[in-house]
């Protein structure tokens, strides 16, 4: 499956963009997010490439200090209650417990911004992606992957964090965007939506896929998150959308046929070992590029997104399993974990392969419109 | 086809016990939560207590919480729920029920017949 | 909890109508609904789930509709074996709860 690039491909033809949206980002949702007073509640502190691993995933990822960009993981947020949007607004609600844990959701008050300055930034993510904006970058070279073939033993973490199910990484998981840009993985977690609800972060086109990965690593100029939080490329994650198909995925199948001893907040297994590739698209070399934020508090920016253009197939089935079986805190069910999508204020994403050239018939004149920037450096 | 059949309620005095037994077949029991739902003469439905595909989360409705326990064993394809310290509001005709997912907290697809307990000096 | 009112809780209507039964939640549900049909001394039968689906083996004539917190069940046209209490059901939210009941009487 490829994203869509044509309009016939894209189920909501051109949509609203972030790019034209000219409401700050975290005050207010973009018109094609505004939650709807119909929509059920989503109830998600959202998750996570901004949950990062705690000092018991990676020993070297220690805080130094409370300042902002300084961060452990206990103040990162975690989720306390249902919102209303089907599309959850950029707003959260803060509470002090006895850990200090900072407590929010998503269509609840105060604004994130209060919750983490970081939040009211002019680069947020997620984006909604327009192919035919995109600026092709042909030094943008394949994806490079290596030790992410694990064997069952030692076995990893499975966890219900409230926001999300997440799955920490063991050392030694590297990936290159390219040459001098190294990269160690840290955990995966997954964003989704609920029954007959899509709930990826990112859309194409405004269309939103039913579900999202994240593979969130750290630069190997940094030795702790802390130190590489809202250092532009400090972070990358690599995200991938989730789609139905006809057959069961079984790479999938060896995390989601866990997720009931999961199934509360808080809780957690201990699961084989997989090959975490092969959770990701196989083709490594298309993907749009672009840099954003983490898409929670503390919302930190400058890390490097790279989105796939292919997407994953799962069954209907699966894809029920992971919006049904997990709850989040009180008695609400864990759905609808993403964040709406946030205006581009003039980033452009670039793209491996030409992703504005459309084969189809009604389109002969290729649209690109941006240049490439960077050209992948 | 899909059977599910109840066993072992009865007449019993408040503060008695009582354990009933709900014996599957036609499908792959392992792969399915299961619940317990009871009716009080004459009354509607109330969810009492699930188990999930598994056995590995219990939930309880608050009016029973404490007092029963939900269990499965998957290599006998049977479900349980040991009821404690019975009121005579327990009385009621309790089925068991598949829901239509490993999770418990689902729609039941299948309902057995039903077993009736009794609670009363 | 979320409470599930259901309305009418009875009705009387003759073989060959429609009748519409409606259930309302105290908050959003989705379309995490089911209705069943019970008959006296008999267990519940599940007709529809996710507020749309039909149960396999449940004759078309029967069909539901909503989403959020407004849900009905519609029997196009009904027949003689129809006549039978119905009940809704959330399972949204914990603890999964039922509606109180229609029963529909013939006319």
């Known amino acids: 499956q490829r994203l869509p690039r044509m309009q016939e491909d894209s189920p909501l033809g051109g949509g609203s963009s972030g790019e034209d949206d000219p409401l700050g980002e975290e005050d207010l949702p973009s018109e094609e997010d505004s939650p709807r007073e119909e929509d059920p509640p989503g109830e998600e502190d959202l998750p996570g490439e901004e949950d990062l691993p705690g000092e018991e995933d990676l020993p070297e990822v220690k805080p130094k200090s409370e300042e902002e960009g300084s961060l452990k993981l206990e103040d990162l947020p975690t989720v306390e209650a249902p919102g209303d949007p089907q599309e959850p607004q950029n707003n959260a609600h803060r509470d002090k417990e006895g850990d200090d844990q900072s407590h929010w959701r998503y269509g609840g008050d105060p604004p994130w911004p209060r919750v983490s300055p970081a939040c009211a930034g002019r680069f947020q993510s997620p984006v909604d992606i327009r192919p035919q904006l995109a600026a092709f970058c042909p030094a943008l070279r394949p994806l490079e992957l290596l030790g992410f073939q694990l064997p069952p033993l030692p076995e990893l973490r499975l966890r219900n964090n409230g926001h999300s199910v997440q799955l920490t990484l063991p050392p030694g998981l590297e990936m290159a965007l390219g040459p001098g840009r190294e990269y160690r993985a840290l955990q995966l977690h997954l964003h989704w939506g609920a029954a007959g609800r899509p709930g990826s972060e990112h859309t194409v086109e405004g269309h939103r896929f039913p579900a999202e990965i994240h593979v969130v690593h750290l630069s190997t100029a940094f030795a702790r998150v802390d130190e590489a939080l809202g250092r532009p490329g400090g972070l990358a994650v690599l995200a991938a959308f989730l789609e139905e198909g006809p057959e069961e995925n079984s790479a999938y199948e060896q995390l989601l046929s866990r997720l009931e001893e999961i199934a509360e907040e808080g809780s957690e297994t201990q699961v084989p070992g997989l090959d975490i590739s092969a959770l990701l698209p196989s083709d490594f070399s298309r993907y749009f590029q672009y840099e954003g934020s983490l898409t929670t508090p503390p919302c930190a920016q400058g890390v490097i997104w790279t989105v796939f253009n292919q997407t994953v197939m799962l069954s209907a089935k699966q894809l029920h399993t992971l919006s049904d079986t997990l709850w989040g805190p009180g008695d609400s069910r864990l759905q609808l974990n993403f964040r709406a999508t946030q205006p581009l204020n003039g980033r452009v994403i670039e793209a491996s392969f030409p992703a504005g050239v459309d084969s189809s018939p009604r389109a002969a004149e290729p649209v690109q419109l941006n240049s490439c920037l960077a050209a992948g450096d | 086809q899909v059977e599910l059949v109840e066993s072992g309620g009865g007449l019993v005095q408040p503060g008695g016990s009582l354990r009933l037994s709900c014996a599957a077949s036609g499908f792959t029991f392992s792969s399915y939560g299961m619940s317990w739902v009871r009716q009080a003469p004459g009354k509607g439905l109330e969810w009492v207590s699930g188990?999930?595909?598994?056995?590995?989360?219990?939930y309880y409705a608050d009016s029973v919480k404490g007092r029963f326990t939900i269990s499965r064993d998957n290599s006998k394809n049977t479900l349980y729920l040991q009821m404690n310290s019975l009121r005579a509001e327990d009385t009621a005709v309790y089925y068991c029920?598949?829901?239509?997912?490993?999770?418990?907290?689902?729609?039941?697809?299948?309902w057995g017949q039903g077993t009736l307990v009794t609670v009363s000096s | 909890d979320i409470q599930m009112t259901q309305s009418p809780s009875s009705l009387s209507a003759s073989v060959g109508d429609r009748v519409t039964i409606t259930c309302r939640a105290s908050q959003d549900i989705n379309n995490y609904l089911s209705w069943y049909q019970q008959k006296p001394g008999k267990a519940p039968k599940l007709l529809i789930y996710?507020?749309?689906n039909l149960q396999s083996g449940v004759p078309s004539r029967f069909s539901g509709s909503g989403s959020g917190t407004d849900f009905t069940l519609t029997i196009s046209s009904l027949q003689p074996e129809d006549f039978a209490v119905y009940y809704c059901?959330?399972?949204?939210?914990?603890?999964?709860?039922f509606g109180q009941g229609t029963k529909v009487e013939i006319k």
């Open positions: 059901q959330q399972y949204y939210g914990r603890p999964t709860t």
């Open positions: 996710g507020a749309s």
């Open positions: 188990i999930s595909s598994l056995g590995s989360t219990t």
């Open positions: 029920a598949r829901t239509g997912s490993p999770g418990t907290f689902m729609h039941g697809d299948h």
